[in-house]
């Protein structure tokens, strides 16, 4: 059976949304209006992994890109990147562990952590334009609480 | 210091069920990011990778063989289990165990290998 | 799947030469590359991986290169116990795969 995908935008907590900066890197800034066209849809993909009620194994791909969030060591530190695919191959139902995080729903807010570096999470700064990062630390400075806008196909 | 080892039944007969252990120590299948890999060899041939388990229980399987092929873990006994199905003669070989952490996979550590000929 | 392809099979050089042995995929593996060491009585070890990163322990003669396709494994200083086959494995997509090996003798 072929993957069951959705299209959706993220924002985070403080209402940030993610946008692309450059060609391999996301930042998030406060949009409005007409700006608000800026930001990347997400195809989310619900992959092959340890599931329960409210954590959900999700793959997150660009839309109509060929490029997914993954998660790799670099210098020994846990890294969020954007990585390139053959869009023959991709989205599958059993994704690379590196694409893999668990979207987790606590109190209607999303956290995504990386089924590779478990306590490690999808994470934005206070500070406006900068790039979206994979964080070792919850309830800090840095934020890991996003909302989820679903976008019609 | 980081051993695995690799042990199998030597000889079995076509239509049979190869079980494979790897005992290993060193490093615990607990620890986060932790993997292991079985990797096989025909006699003057290649490598070709079967299947791989990760330290929260997530397998991987060639497609090739994957309807034949389980993996398996024992995490407080350092023990990872491949079970190969209906096996025939082009099963036979020398069957490899490795250890990685994440992905994507480097192979850091392999065991010596154990021979397995499936003959008649 | 993901196809590697290492064209030499077998090859000769002299204790010194500097060798170079070429793994090409079937499609681009973005640097997740590693090369393997395979001595004579079975015994395998990582030498490289992420394309150039030197595994510990491994001497400095060993070096890797490569991008996209097309990636490299090159002993500068050829010495007597480099005898062995070396592979190549993409870990960029499932399933892993390696190239087909390349024999390494001495002239």
């Known amino acids: 059976a072929p993957v069951r995908s959705l299209n959706c935008t993220l924002r985070d907590s403080q209402q940030k949304s993610l946008v692309m900066s450059g060609p391999y890197e996301l930042k998030a800034l406060h949009l409005q209006g007409q700006d608000m066209e800026q930001q990347v849809v997400f195809s989310m993909s619900f992959v092959q992994g340890e599931e329960s009620n409210d954590k959900i194994p999700v793959a997150l791909g660009l839309k109509e890109k060929n490029l997914y969030l993954s998660c790799v060591l670099k210098d020994d530190k846990p890294t969020l990147q954007l990585e390139s695919v053959d869009p023959k191959n991709y989205p599958k139902k059993k994704m690379e562990k590196r694409f893999v995080f668990n979207k987790i729903e606590i109190n209607n807010k999303l956290e995504f952590e990386s089924a590779q570096f478990p306590n490690w999470y999808i994470s934005t700064s206070q500070a406006e334009n900068m790039p979206v990062f994979l964080g070792g630390t919850k309830g800090g400075q840095d934020i890991t609480d996003f909302t989820m806008q679903f976008v019609s196909s | 210091q980081v051993t695995l080892k690799e042990s199998g039944p030597g000889i079995l007969k076509p239509s049979q069920t190869l079980s494979l252990t790897c005992s290993f120590s060193g490093f615990s299948l607990s620890t986060s990011g932790m993997g292991v890999g079985w990797i096989r060899q025909p006699s003057g041939k290649g490598l070709e990778w079967l299947a791989h388990i990760w330290w929260d229980g997530d397998e991987s399987y060639n497609p090739s063989l994957k309807t034949r092929l389980t993996i398996s873990k024992n995490t407080s006994r350092n023990q990872v289990f491949l079970k190969i199905t209906t096996v025939d003669t082009v099963d036979t070989a020398t069957y490899f165990c490795a250890r990685n952490r994440y992905d994507p996979p480097w192979f850091v550590d392999w065991g010596q290998g154990t021979l397995v000929t499936v003959s008649s | 799947d993901i196809q590697m392809t290492q064209t030499t099979s077998s090859l000769s050089a002299s204790l010194g030469d500097r060798v170079t042995i070429s793994c090409r995929a079937s499609?681009?593996?973005?640097?997740?590359l590693s090369w393997y060491q395979q001595k004579p009585d079975g015994t395998v070890k990582l030498l490289i991986y992420?394309?150039?990163k030197l595994h510990s322990g491994v001497p400095s003669r060993f070096s890797g290169s490569g991008s996209g396709t097309d990636y490299f494994l090159t002993i500068s200083n050829l010495e007597q116990e480099d005898i062995a086959t070396y592979f190549c494995l993409q870990g960029k997509m499932l399933p892993w795969t390696f190239g087909g090996g390349t024999k390494l003798e001495i002239k």
């Open positions: 499609q681009d593996i973005s640097n997740y």
């Open positions: 992420y394309t150039s």
